[in-house]
């Protein structure tokens, strides 16, 4: 058991350029407070998993109020550390949610107003009972600046909080196999005691009074040997005679929820959905109001002004529970058609779409010409794994919008000046060249290069490129 | 607060372009697709097309495809519309909307009415 | 294209009553994947911007009032208001989303 201890100190403009507004005036003074939520492991910041390790909610700061013209200088912080109690081991590695509120202290109708102004995640590791960690981050134009630490409580110590310490027996020295507990030189590490019974070659403990099993051996102490080649099912007959896999207390046996949560069981422990008014790993956390900000990830609080009134969270995009603790799973509805990828982005969902698709969904056919008119009279062409636009003259690029400048390419050859034309181009030839793009020289005698002269043109005229 | 702020409204003449424009905030421009949609008295809504943020790519209704083009400007977080050769028909409310891959038109613009008039 | 049709095109009901409202899609809206279907409502206050209702055809979006309930699918959707109120003045569109965009011509209703 332990303390994980967060100390804020400061929450204000970061630098560089776009300053934020400040987030209180004078006609709505406001007060800032934080709350952390911390989760075992470097699971995403957004994982399922509600804030399994805990969390914790900061004093209100004091009221503030923008002095006008001046820039949003820090703004002014609750007193004392959030304290996040963990009663098992602690991880070693963690993720961390910091999230900075305003209570705005206007004349708002039915109590203050509750806005998240920054969010900031991250996923450390940390050995418990080290020196504080210095940390800035930053959310936007905002920035954060804070420490943290986990500590043990006695007469838990190491870096986990899983050895306990008790007063030494002797004056000079600890038992055999025992250490001195540093940093509390007068006291003695204190043997691991597992279960009573625990079998001291097929079992194991990490905590006191537990009895883990190694790998072949089962059974409340680990003295049944596991053979699931007579087993009638995976949790079959529970006979240690049979020796077979005999499935240990369940992780929702007795209902460890709390004050009327339902327990469901996940792939490592268990997890409480819990009835409104109550929140925390087994619904413990009674008595909440608006003001205690049960409202995870964004959600708004609305009601719940005395601990007796129902409060209710309207949750943002993605995220759902009576304390929008969960995060709702969006990509299984498997949105994305023509074998797009989903991405939850948290705030929205995306698709990634294969090449040749598009649209929120994939449902666009790129390649299909029935699906994506040229503009201006352009025709699709379709082949290649994509569409084409083969455009009416004047007019380019890939749908045909752009207008195009028939002379850009400078089609017209030895030194003709080029005109753009309503139905094309025009090539104006230099003298001695003729043809649509003044290719082919006039010779000497008045003969051309050309089988024949098309009737009525002389060498020079301007030729109209059709 | 996720927001879609139009421009104002347009009077123009017939055979004009009028280009409207889309202000996204609130949230991340490039991770939605903006659409825009067509409204005439009694004619309901009819979509004209949409825009993806991320990489420009756009498609239309057909029947919009020489009337109209979209264009989206991510520095700034704004979508346009540019209509061209107006008409009568031309005359409507023009509004923006936001999607993506879970939610339909979630987010609306409060509008842009357009009259076209000599 | 698909095509979208609303019927009734307008209902006049008094307050407290049920509301049933209908639209067809010239074609399947039924994606076989994952067998949802890409059909939105939306409602239109006077003077207002449309406001999504419902999505995937019958997902109540997040602050819908519960007597708004979407229902149907392939072809033939519903939308319906178990107990009309002065503020459901409003005319109402369905959207298919499945191919394109296209929109229903409304439903309006009014209030006696």
């Known amino acids: 058991a332990g303390v994980f201890e967060l100390q804020i100190h400061s929450f204000g403009p970061g630098p560089g350029p776009g300053a934020p507004r400040s987030p209180c005036s004078a006609r709505l003074p406001c007060r800032l407070f934080f709350r952390v939520c911390l989760k075992p492991g470097l699971s995403e910041e957004a994982a399922e998993s509600p804030c399994a390790l805990g969390a914790a909610l900061s004093a209100r700061g004091p009221v503030y109020t923008e002095q006008p013209g001046a820039p949003a200088p820090d703004l002014p912080l609750p007193d004392g550390l959030l304290q996040v109690p963990f009663r098992d081991a602690w991880p070693g590695t963690f993720s961390f949610i910091i999230e900075t509120w305003r209570e705005e202290l206007g004349d708002q109708i039915g109590g203050p107003a509750w806005s998240l102004l920054a969010r900031v995640a991250g996923r450390r590791r940390l050995a418990a009972g080290g020196p504080w960690a210095r940390d800035i981050q930053r959310a936007g134009a905002w920035e954060l600046r804070f420490s943290y630490r986990a500590r043990c409580e006695p007469p838990a110590v190491g870096t986990a909080c899983t050895r306990l310490c008790r007063p030494r027996s002797a004056p000079s020295r600890c038992g055999p196999g025992l250490r001195p507990c540093a940093p509390l030189e007068d006291e003695c590490e204190a043997p691991l005691v597992c279960r009573a019974g625990c079998s001291p070659e097929h079992g194991f403990c990490e905590q006191p009074g537990e009895c883990r099993c190694l790998e072949g051996w089962t059974g409340p102490l680990c003295t049944v040997p596991v053979s699931t080649s007579s087993c009638l099912s995976p949790r079959g007959p529970s006979s240690a005679t049979t020796g077979c896999l005999v499935p240990g207390p369940g992780p929702c046996d007795g209902n460890p929820c709390a004050n009327g949560g339902s327990c469901s069981e996940t792939p490592r422990s268990f997890e409480c959905t819990c009835p409104r008014g109550f929140y925390g790993l087994r619904c413990e956390v009674s008595g909440v109001t608006c003001a205690d900000g049960p409202c995870f990830n964004g959600g708004l609080c609305v009601g719940g002004a005395d601990p007796d009134s129902a409060y209710i969270c309207h949750c943002p995009p993605g995220f759902q529970g009576s304390n929008c603790e969960k995060r709702v799973d969006r990509c299984s509805l498997q949105p994305c058609r023509n074998g797009g990828l989903c991405l939850d982005l948290g705030h929205a969902l995306r698709c990634r779409c294969r090449a040749g698709f598009a649209g929120p969904r994939c449902e666009h056919d790129l390649d299909d010409c029935a699906g994506r008119a040229c503009a201006n009279g352009g025709t699709c062409v379709e082949g290649g794994g994509a569409h084409r636009c083969s455009c009416a003259l004047g007019f380019g690029g890939r749908d045909c919008r752009e207008r195009a400048d028939p002379c850009a390419a400078r089609p017209c050859a030895h030194g003709g000046r080029c005109y753009a034309h309503f139905s094309g181009l025009v090539c104006a030839c230099a003298p001695g060249y003729m043809g649509a793009r003044c290719e082919f020289p006039v010779h000497p005698d008045g003969a051309s290069a050309l089988p024949a002269a098309p009737p009525g043109l002389r060498p020079g005229d301007p030729q109209r490129y059709l | 607060e996720v927001q879609l702020q139009q421009s104002g409204a347009e009077l123009v003449r017939p055979g004009a372009l009028v280009k409207l424009s889309c202000k996204a905030s609130?949230?991340?421009?490039?991770?939605?697709?903006i659409h825009w949609v067509k409204q005439r008295p009694e004619l309901g809504l009819e979509w004209i097309g949409w825009?993806?943020?991320?990489?420009?790519?756009?498609i239309y209704d057909p029947k919009f495809q020489d009337k109209a083009s979209i264009t989206a400007d991510t520095s700034s977080n704004t979508a346009y519309l540019h209509l061209s050769s107006l008409t009568s028909e031309g005359t409507a409310v023009y509004y923006c909307?936001?999607?993506?891959?879970?939610?339909?038109?979630?987010?609306w613009g409060q509008g842009t009415l357009v009259t076209v008039s000599a | 294209d698909i095509v979208m049709s609303q019927s009734p095109s307008s209902l006049a009901v008094s307050v407290g009553e049920k509301v049933t409202m209908r639209c067809k899609s010239s074609?399947?809206?039924?994606?076989?994947?994952?067998?949802?279907?890409?059909l939105a409502w939306y409602q239109q206050k006077p003077g207002q911007s449309p406001k999504l209702l419902i999505y995937?055809?019958?997902t109540r979006e997040s602050g819908v009032p519960d007597r708004f309930t979407g229902s149907g699918s392939g072809t033939d959707f519903t939308l319906t208001i178990s107990s009309v109120k002065a503020e459901d003045l409003a005319v109402y569109f369905c959207?298919?989303?499945?191919?394109?965009?296209?929109f229903g011509g409304g439903t309006k209703l009014e209030i006696k």
């Open positions: 074609q399947s809206l039924l994606y076989s994947s994952n067998q949802k279907n890409y």
């Open positions: 959207q298919q989303y499945y191919s394109y965009r296209t």
């Open positions: 909307a936001s999607e993506d891959a879970y939610y339909p038109f979630a987010y």
């Open positions: 995937w055809a019958s």
């Open positions: 609130g949230f991340n421009f490039k991770d939605y697709y």
């Open positions: 825009i993806d943020p991320e990489n420009g790519n756009a």
